[in-house]
């Protein structure tokens, strides 16, 4: 028998993290995002739930809505109308899928200090928003869109086709929400509030995924979701625009789909209002390597929207799929014609381009062996964006300003030297014309949010610095985190290593690989985190490593598109390569190496365990994909093509976890899944389990009844992490 090993952090007054610390969220951090309402004013919900109005220039703040008013309707969120007369209060939040939820809404009249009575909103509402000007309301109820000219007015019904699980107006169906829009809404007001654009999704022909929800009743309920798996029939989409000033006169007008898109199956990917009578729609072929951006104008004389062919811009990838995870959206200039957009340059790195007439004549604005990530704001004289350029670390994010008024444009890094050790991963929130902005730093040190002058970039004030967290971490022995790169052949892999306190290179430690590895993802990021793996390093003395292999993002298309049409190959290969390199470092106990992952990471960890290399003693897969035929069409097909004989069926079949069932014989495998997983269906784990049983391979499994893809209910989460901890400690012969 192997003697049990107990890791004891050496003599130190500081204590190690406990699993309880993690499960209680003891060391969670705060961020501060201003809710901008003008160039120099914003709202923020205080800790005690007052809605506070801030004026940066006067340095004044006052409560516009008291917590007692919030409490009177159990509100958890709010939204101020642009004319500042009303606030909607959101309560009875009821989660649906990743972004969607239903809620009850109340309208509070700030001028009269009372709730608006009469023509109250129905419940539950699927989505509600103010117009960008004034106080019109658009909302979605039972899959139909309604309009109120003022909160106290009767509603006007804009659509009548809505039907549960069949036709969705103004909100996405399951697959569009999760894989295309990443929002709970599919409607957009024009800047002046005259027009309302919306999408209609017709799911009538989509196959249904059905699963049991056990609840507390005598009989389980069945949840039915139209969910197109790879190769299945997809939603049929149409985009409409309605004039909200006279909605009854003309009714919704359909926006035409570009010919080259409409000739076969296609997707709508995003809508951007350019001006009050100009709109930009983005479309994508079902084979997602061709994207078309179409600029459309309102023709008063025809009462129609016209999308001329010379205002169609095609973006095509010859090495993979169009865009990154999603196709990027345009950031239009003041002229309402030209725009800035991120797409791959000739070297395969994603950079900002300026498009004035055609994509062929695009002017490249940024360049280099790094990637532009996001365009935050374009003003008359500046463009603000984020990138991972600084010091060549792909897992960092800094904010840059390009002065577009100058010729040639000059570039300045706004964040690179602010708090260099503490802050290497930023996002930002800008007032409308970037007179002021907030920077939110996520690490690697403690997160901090600050307010800045948009002209000088001068810091005005600290909004949140996580002082309490800093104090509570003072007596905690945190592990040491390293971000480095390793080379293998012509490839470079960035990795993050989390080392136990008092780490000693001359000793041997167990190693746990945490993997995600999905296309266009990134795990090696310079961010602060105190989570389960932090605890494993701090208390249990386990070395943790995360590796970004081929297929991961922000290192150019050669690296990203390597996995195109062959998922499950290089992602796994690169984890194995990294493990071998870690062993060569000399401080890893070769007999005690494990791998774990969730979702795509569960797929990769399963395939790694079944690689037949003997590198891993054990591993865990939580909610894994087991076959790309079981997953959503938009996602699977983006990276794998279609599961048909004349396309890529062969690789769909040989990249399944089930195909490797025999190879699990010599590893300890823990398979975990929630039974109410709407995203990666329980079917995936059921098929793995079936294949392992058929192959007479022993394994461990845990299901979580009525839990979804996040297994996030308090009790389930506690049980999950406690269970995985026991499994790992047993595997590594660590005593309890």
């Amino acid at each position: 028998l192997r003697p049990s090993r107990v890791y004891k952090p050496e003599g130190n007054t500081k204590r190690a993290l406990t699993l309880k610390d993690i499960l209680n969220g003891t060391f969670s951090y705060k961020t501060y995002f201003p809710n901008w309402i003008s160039e120099q004013e914003y709202l923020h919900q205080s800790e005690d739930d007052n809605i506070v109005f801030y004026n940066i220039e006067t340095r004044e703040s006052y409560i516009i809505l008291s917590n007692s008013t919030m409490k009177s309707v159990n509100a958890t969120d709010y939204g101020l109308s642009p004319d500042r007369q009303f606030v909607y209060l959101e309560s009875d939040y009821s989660k649906l899928w990743r972004y969607s939820y239903t809620a009850t809404y109340y309208i509070y009249d700030l001028q009269n200090g009372e709730f608006v009575r009469g023509y109250e909103l129905p419940r539950p509402i699927q989505y509600l928003c103010w117009s960008p000007v004034g106080s019109k309301l658009a909302y979605v109820y039972q899959n139909n869109i309604y309009l109120k000219q003022r909160p106290g007015d009767p509603p006007f019904q804009i659509t009548y086709t809505g039907r549960e699980n069949r036709i969705f107006n103004g909100i996405p169906d399951w697959v569009y929400e999760e894989e295309m829009l990443a929002t709970k809404y599919a409607l957009w007001w024009s800047p002046d509030g005259k027009f309302l654009a919306y999408v209609e999704f017709n799911d009538s022909d989509i196959p249904i995924i059905a699963y049991s929800y056990y609840g507390d009743g005598q009989y389980p309920r069945t949840i039915n979701i139209p969910y197109p798996k790879a190769g299945a029939k997809n939603p049929v989409v149409r985009v409409f625009i309605v004039d909200t000033t006279y909605p009854h006169h003309v009714g919704p007008m359909e926006v035409p789909v570009p010919e080259m898109i409409a000739s076969s199956d296609y997707y709508f990917s995003w809508l951007t209002w350019v001006s009050s009578e100009r709109v930009c729609l983005q479309w994508l072929k079902r084979v997602q390597n061709v994207s078309v951006l179409s600029i459309c104008d309102f023709r008063e004389d025809w009462h129609a929207w016209e999308c001329p062919k010379n205002q169609e811009h095609v973006e095509e990838s010859r090495t993979g799929w169009a865009g990154g995870f999603f196709v990027s959206t345009p950031a239009f200039s003041q002229d309402a014609t030209s725009y800035y957009k991120i797409f791959s340059d000739k070297d395969g790195y994603k950079h900002i381009h300026y498009i004035k007439d055609t994509v062929e004549n695009a002017i490249q604005i940024t360049s280099g062996k790094w990637e532009a990530i996001y365009i935050f704001r374009v003003t008359q004289d500046s463009l603000f964006y984020s990138s991972n350029e600084f010091e060549g670390y792909p897992g960092r994010r800094n904010i840059y300003r390009i002065s577009i008024g100058n010729s040639p444009p000059s570039k300045k890094c706004v964040t690179c030297h602010l708090r260099k050790e503490r802050c290497q991963y930023y996002t930002a929130s800008f007032s409308y014309k970037a007179k002021y902005y907030a920077l939110v730093c996520y690490g690697p040190g403690l997160p901090i949010s600050t307010l800045h002058d948009g002209r000088t970039d001068q810091e005005i004030q600290v909004l949140e610095e996580n002082k309490e967290l800093e104090n509570s971490l003072r007596n905690i022995q945190l592990p040491k985190v390293e971000i480095k790169k390793l080379k293998d052949g012509g490839l470079t892999f960035w990795y993050k290593m989390i080392l136990p306190p008092q780490f000693d290179r001359s000793k041997k430690y167990p190693l746990l690989i945490q993997v995600y590895g999905g296309p266009c993802s990134q795990s090696v990021k310079s961010v602060f985190a105190v989570n389960w793996i932090t605890y494993l390093a701090s208390k249990e003395g386990i070395v943790i490593a995360l590796v970004d292999g081929r297929g991961t993002a922000f290192q150019g298309d050669k690296f990203l598109h390597a996995v195109y049409r062959k998922l499950g190959v290089y992602e796994v290969e690169d984890q194995l390569t990294a493990v071998r390199k870690f062993i060569e470092m000399g401080f890893i106990d070769e007999e005690r190496i494990a791998i774990w992952g969730w979702s795509y990471g569960g797929y990769v960890s399963s395939l790694a365990l079944a690689s037949g290399t003997g590198l891993f003693k054990c591993g865990i897969a939580v909610a894994p994909v087991s076959s790309w035929e079981y997953y959503a069409s938009i996602y699977s097909e983006r990276f794998m093509g279609l599961p048909t004989k004349d396309d890529n069926l062969e690789h769909y079949k040989n990249s399944t976890v089930m195909a490797r069932a025999e190879y699990f014989r010599n590893v300890d495998y823990l398979l975990i899944h929630g039974t109410a997983d709407d995203n990666v269906h329980f079917q995936n784990s059921a098929q793995i389990a079936k294949a392992l049983v058929n192959a007479q391979v022993d394994f461990q499994a845990m299901w979580y009844s009525d839990q979804n893809h996040g297994i996030s209910s308090g009790r389930s989460q506690n049980h999950l992490y406690t269970h995985m901890t026991h499994f790992l400690k047993q595997c590594f012969s660590l005593s309890d």
Epitope: S38, E39, E41, E57, R84
Partner: nanobody, 115 residues
């Protein structure tokens, strides 16, 4: 503490004009967002026009280009020029912050439009 005092109301014929003034006693910054509101007895108070510290303005739909909000930072004053007045503009007019603060409603100034 800031007190807001409105003046300039009166009786005027349809199509006539008035200039309403609001003076702040106490320090009121030019960067404060301010607004004019009105209320007809028995009805709810409503926004007429708002102006941010940056000079961005917002008018209610019923204004239809007839009214103009402005400010004189040197005099700590907020103004509302009313042109093309109609009988339905008859109301008590108030100034306040924008969004309004419940404790800052003054006495208002009465505007009556009648022939």
């Amino acid at each position: 503490d800031v007190q807001l005092v409105e003046s300039g109301g009166g009786l005027v014929q349809p199509g006539g004009s008035l200039r309403l003034s609001c003076v702040a006693s106490g320090r009121l910054s030019s960067s404060n967002s301010m607004a004019w509101y009105r209320q007809v007895p028995g009805k709810r108070r409503e926004l007429v026009a708002g102006i941010t510290g940056g000079g961005e303005t917002n008018y209610a739909d019923f204004v239809g280009g007839r009214f103009t909000i402005s400010r004189d930072n040197a005099k700590n004053g907020l103004y509302l020029q009313l042109n093309g007045l109609k009988p339905e503009d008859t109301a008590a007019y108030y100034c306040n912050f924008w969004p309004p603060l419940i404790n800052y409603w003054g006495q208002g100034t009465q505007v009556t439009v009648s022939s």
